[in-house]
């Protein structure tokens, strides 16, 4: 009986034409929905002219249903058992399940201003650039609605640049009508162990963002795991959101609409600066801001978005170092909220329910050449928005998964 | 097509007054920024003064400041330079030159400027 | 100030010679340097900027190279028309600051 169903499961989660698991994998049939926080800013002028603490109150959630496009030029390829493919973007906003509208106004860094000040840290450059954000009357902070901080604005500023240069600036831009990829993940049919491990992404088996380990692509995409999870295993899998290979460990079992699922979770020994976790050595890549490589909880992704400081971290600065949070006021992180977790059914490897959260932070530094950066006497690296990637298995499909899966089993 | 083309040099005597000017075409001088830069006779260059883009701040070499003055007249898409109490070593040809991230992509013919008694 | 020192000062050369010019910032300039080439009687002409970007039309023999504080311009086979003046320039710090030139001479 098990091995029967060992080789039918075997032969289900394949990825390729006719299998269960190739239908689900090509669209999902899960809802993904991606809630977004936004971090408003309540004291702007306090914190530019006196270098106060930012005092941040987050409105949300602004929700938009995500995924919901198949993949892309999905190419088989026999020799090496590969399956190639974009995974397009597309983002919808679902007003019902949003507290407002994406013309709300949100108070904001900066995010043009922020980003020049840290590529052109030379002083004649943060001369001109002075002069450009004067004459724009742009400052530290900015009024943005949510449309235009997640997907796009044409920013005053860099429009005064005598240069082709790009002038649109969204921390999601540009994101509708673009895709993510090419992803060439095996298939399986050789090594079902091996089963939507991602061999290349874009072309290389490695990101060019890190040194050593920390630069590898691992795992799959976490949309699923090669059958038969086991509790003991580290689960590892890639997040282009974050640049990086990113592990979980098991917590808990989990009864899911009928379906015994193991909760992995994303550890705060993930995020530990190399002095708790030697293994987070590379993921350190200056000393200024890092202290040293102590700070722990924000990863900079900067080499990733062209330059920008960006860092990425768990909502409200959830298992980051306290000099990290110290300069912003109002934050509370808790683990149930604001941590990440997949919920696996072991047989099959699927992910049927997940919680993805992340937060998108900018750094802005004191500058003595910029005005409106002159009085500032620290470094901050200021939250933006957080978000809550959700998608749980539907009614009908675990039905499905429970007579034709689990309940064979059981 | 971008030019600059320079005016206004000529024979000073020590202490004496001057006013460049250079009158640009092809692109907007305040997108930019101008520069002005010498060359004193069989020496190498010395940048001299510079006004920042959108009328936005000056500066100056030490061994001018005080003396010489950078402006700009947008609506005729023409910079100045106003070299007061003028020394020998003043002796120069005097570019403008185009910049806008601190490298010059286009420069003037260039306008002597002589000064002795 | 940022002094830029080029070397050397003056070089004799043939035509279709490699001719290598190094220039040394006082303090880190990243990339920030620029060169030029400067003819008797003439305004300079932009080469490279960014200490490795060829400036458009300027032909593909002229190369920059170098970080921080050490820059090199090379001419890898030199024509008639480059016997001239050549001049780097660091446009990182203000005052911009240029080498004392290196002038380049008929063998």
């Known amino acids: 009986g098990d091995l029967l169903i060992q080789k039918t499961i075997k032969k289900q989660v394949v990825l390729e034409e006719g299998t269960i698991a190739f239908k689900n994998w090509v669209k999902t049939g899960t809802e993904v929905y991606r809630q977004f926080w936004i971090f408003d800013v309540q004291n702007p002028q306090e914190v530019m002219m006196n270098s106060s603490n930012i005092q941040v109150k987050q409105r949300g959630p602004y929700t938009y249903r995500v995924r919901f496009l198949a993949k892309e030029n999905v190419t088989q390829d026999a020799e090496d058992n590969t399956v190639s493919f974009l995974q397009p973007n597309g983002a919808i906003f679902e007003p019902s399940l949003s507290v407002g509208t994406e013309a709300d106004n949100f108070t904001v860094l900066n995010l043009a201003v922020a980003a020049a000040s840290h590529i052109y840290q030379n002083q004649f450059v943060q001369m001109i650039l002075n002069s450009l954000i004067n004459k724009s009357k742009s400052s530290m902070f900015q009024v943005r609605t949510l449309r235009e901080l997640l997907w796009g604005y044409r920013d005053p500023f860099l429009s005064l640049v005598p240069y082709p240069v790009t002038t649109t600036v969204g921390l999601f831009y540009p994101y509708n009508n673009t895709a993510d990829g090419v992803y060439k993940v095996f298939n399986g049919k050789d090594n079902i162990s091996k089963v939507a491990i991602i061999d290349t992404y874009k072309g290389k088996r490695n990101l060019s963002y890190w040194e050593s380990h920390c630069d590898m692509i691992n795992g799959t995409d976490a949309a699923s795991f090669p059958p038969f999870v086991e509790k003991s295993q580290v689960l590892q899998f890639f997040s282009s959101d974050i640049c990086r290979s990113i592990y979980a460990v098991f917590e808990s079992d989990v009864n899911l609409k009928g379906i015994p699922v193991y909760r992995f979770v994303l550890p705060s020994k993930a995020f530990a600066s190399p002095v708790e976790n030697p293994d987070n050595y590379c993921f350190c890549t200056e000393k200024i801001i890092s202290k040293n490589c102590t700070s722990y909880g924000v990863l900079d992704i900067s080499k990733c978005k062209e330059g920008r400081p960006v860092y990425i971290s768990l909502p409200h600065f959830l298992y980051a170092s306290p000099d990290v949070s110290e300069p912003i006021d109002g934050l509370n992180p808790n683990e149930e909220e604001h941590r990440t977790y997949l919920d696996i059914e072991p047989i099959t490897g699927f992910t049927l329910q997940f919680a993805k959260r992340l937060q998108v932070n900018l750094l802005v530094k004191p500058s003595e050449k910029i005005q409106v950066l002159k009085n500032l006497k620290r470094n901050y690296i200021v939250p933006i928005l957080w978000l809550n990637e959700t998608g749980t298995i539907g009614d009908e499909k675990a039905n499905m998964f429970r007579s034709q899966v689990t309940g064979k089993i059981n | 097509e971008v030019q600059l083309v320079e005016s206004g040099g000529g024979l000073v005597q020590p202490g004496g007054s001057l006013r460049l000017s250079c009158a640009a075409s092809?692109?907007?001088?305040?997108?930019?920024?101008i520069h002005w830069v010498r060359q004193a006779p069989g020496k190498g260059l010395e940048w001299v003064a510079w006004?920042?883009?959108?009328?936005?701040?000056?500066y100056y070499a030490d061994s001018v400041k005080g003396r010489f003055t950078i402006s700009a007249d947008t609506s005729k898409n023409t910079a100045y330079l106003q070299m007061n109490s003028l020394r020998a070593e003043d002796t120069a040809v005097y570019y403008c030159?185009?910049?806008?991230?601190?490298?010059?992509?286009?420069w003037g013919q260039g306008t002597l400027v002589t000064v002795s008694s | 100030d940022i002094q830029m020192t080029q070397s050397p000062s003056s070089l004799s050369a043939s035509v279709g010679d490699r001719v290598t010019i190094t220039c040394r910032a006082s303090?880190?300039?990243?990339?920030?340097v620029a060169w030029y080439q400067q003819k008797p009687g003439k305004a300079p002409k932009l080469l490279i900027s960014?200490?490795?970007s060829l400036y458009s039309g300027v032909p593909s023999r002229f190369s920059g190279s170098g970080s921080g504080t050490d820059f090199t311009l090379t001419i890898s086979s030199l024509q008639p028309e480059d016997f001239a003046t050549y001049y780097c320039?660091?446009?990182?710090?203000?005052?911009?600051?240029f080498g004392q030139g290196t002038k380049v001479e008929i063998k």
């Open positions: 030159a185009r910049s806008f991230f601190g490298y010059f992509d286009y």
């Open positions: 960014y200490a490795t």
């Open positions: 303090q880190d300039v990243s990339n920030w």
């Open positions: 006004i920042a883009p959108y009328g936005g701040d000056t």
């Open positions: 320039q660091q446009h990182s710090n203000a005052p911009l600051t």
């Open positions: 092809g692109f907007t001088i305040s997108s930019f920024g």
